[in-house]
Amino acid sequence: APTSSSTKKTQLQLEHLLLDLQMILNGINNYKNPKLTRMLTFKFYMPKKATELKHLQCLEEELKPLEEVLNLAQSKNFHLRPRDLISNINVIVLELKGSETTFMCEYADETATIVEFLNRWITFCQSIISTLT
């Protein structure tokens, strides 16, 4: 059973992940807005189901494409270089989803733009955080 300290740690990691994803979304939306149209040509795969920490496997698999899109953006919109930002997210995702069980991600049929993708994972983080508090 999860202890209060492990729950607290999970909550803090999720809050960190949430802040990173929100920072990316804000950076993109500040990106001379219509220049965003070039970033919207990239498509992202969405999880068929995202209700548990193990489903973060689906986010992990999309981090490389996310980094490629962020490389289109001007660095001044982010405090960190895309590579460092994605590396930080990857570390948190790996810790959160754990490595004990191998989970095969199932993707929905519909693909998404970078904005829809980020909003989906922001909602996921908020939902899990709310169950922990």
Partner: antibody
């Protein structure tokens, strides 16, 4: 309403220079990419390149890099396509269009004829 | 340089379903867009982001994408749908865009 109005048809000789224009109205011209598309007689559409008027950030298709120059003057909401030395193979209809990814609005097209 | 490949022509009878394909190596990661161009006119977008229809485009136009192939489907093609259709996308880096070679749709 949103409009892109292009300059009129041109007839030129090989080796001459040319600049055609595209004036945008009904939207914030400086903060939308503007692109140019070539259509040779009886042929398909070819993406030439795009410019972001606010800072003149420009991207060219490898096929058109060095062959044409795309520029913009945001103070008069106008984009330009220039040739320094025309060739007969430049004969085509040239469209300007708004958008960095897909093009959502198009000009009426400018016919450029290059013939000796 | 990046290429999108389309069949040169597709013919259907009125009321039949027309399918126009577009293949490109980057399409698993890049959205496809479709333009209709009638003779002597500027192109008009009929599908964006693989499968979405802009306002004013009839419901008979639909789009899909799987792997390296995007498809424009016209269910119950009408005579007024006779036109050239172009797929459009960007290369894997997102910097350069490209049109397919175009498909002439004949509805007879």
């Amino acid at each position: 309403q949103m409009q892109l109005v292009q300059s009129g048809a041109e007839v030129k000789k090989p080796g001459e220079s040319l600049e055609i224009s595209c004036e945008g109205s009904g939207y914030s011209f400086s903060t939308y990419w503007i692109g140019w598309v070539r259509q040779m007689p009886g042929k398909g559409l070819e993406w030439m390149g795009i410019i972001y008027p606010d800072d003149s950030d420009t991207r060219y298709s490898p096929s058109f890099q060095g062959q044409v120059t795309i520029s913009a003057d945001k103070s008069i909401s106008t984009a330009y396509l220039q040739w320094s030395s025309l060739k007969a193979s430049d004969t085509a209809v040239y469209y300007c269009a708004r958008g960095g990814g897909p093009f959502d609005y198009w000009g009426q097209g400018t016919l450029v004829t290059v013939s000796s | 340089s990046y290429e999108l490949t389309q069949p040169p022509s597709v013919s259907v009878s009125p009321g039949q379903t027309a399918r126009i394909t577009c293949s490109g190596d980057a399409l698993p990661r890049k959205f496809a867009y479709w333009y209709q161009q009638k003779s002597g006119q500027a192109p008009v977008m009929v599908i964006y982001e693989d499968s979405k229809r802009p306002p004013g485009i009839p419901e008979r136009f639909s789009g899909s994408s799987s792997g390296t192939m995007a498809t424009l489907t016209i269910t119950g093609a009408q005579v007024e749908d006779e036109a050239d259709y172009y797929c459009y996308s960007t290369d894997s880096g997102g910097d350069v865009s490209v049109f397919g070679g175009g498909t002439k749709l004949t509805v007879l």
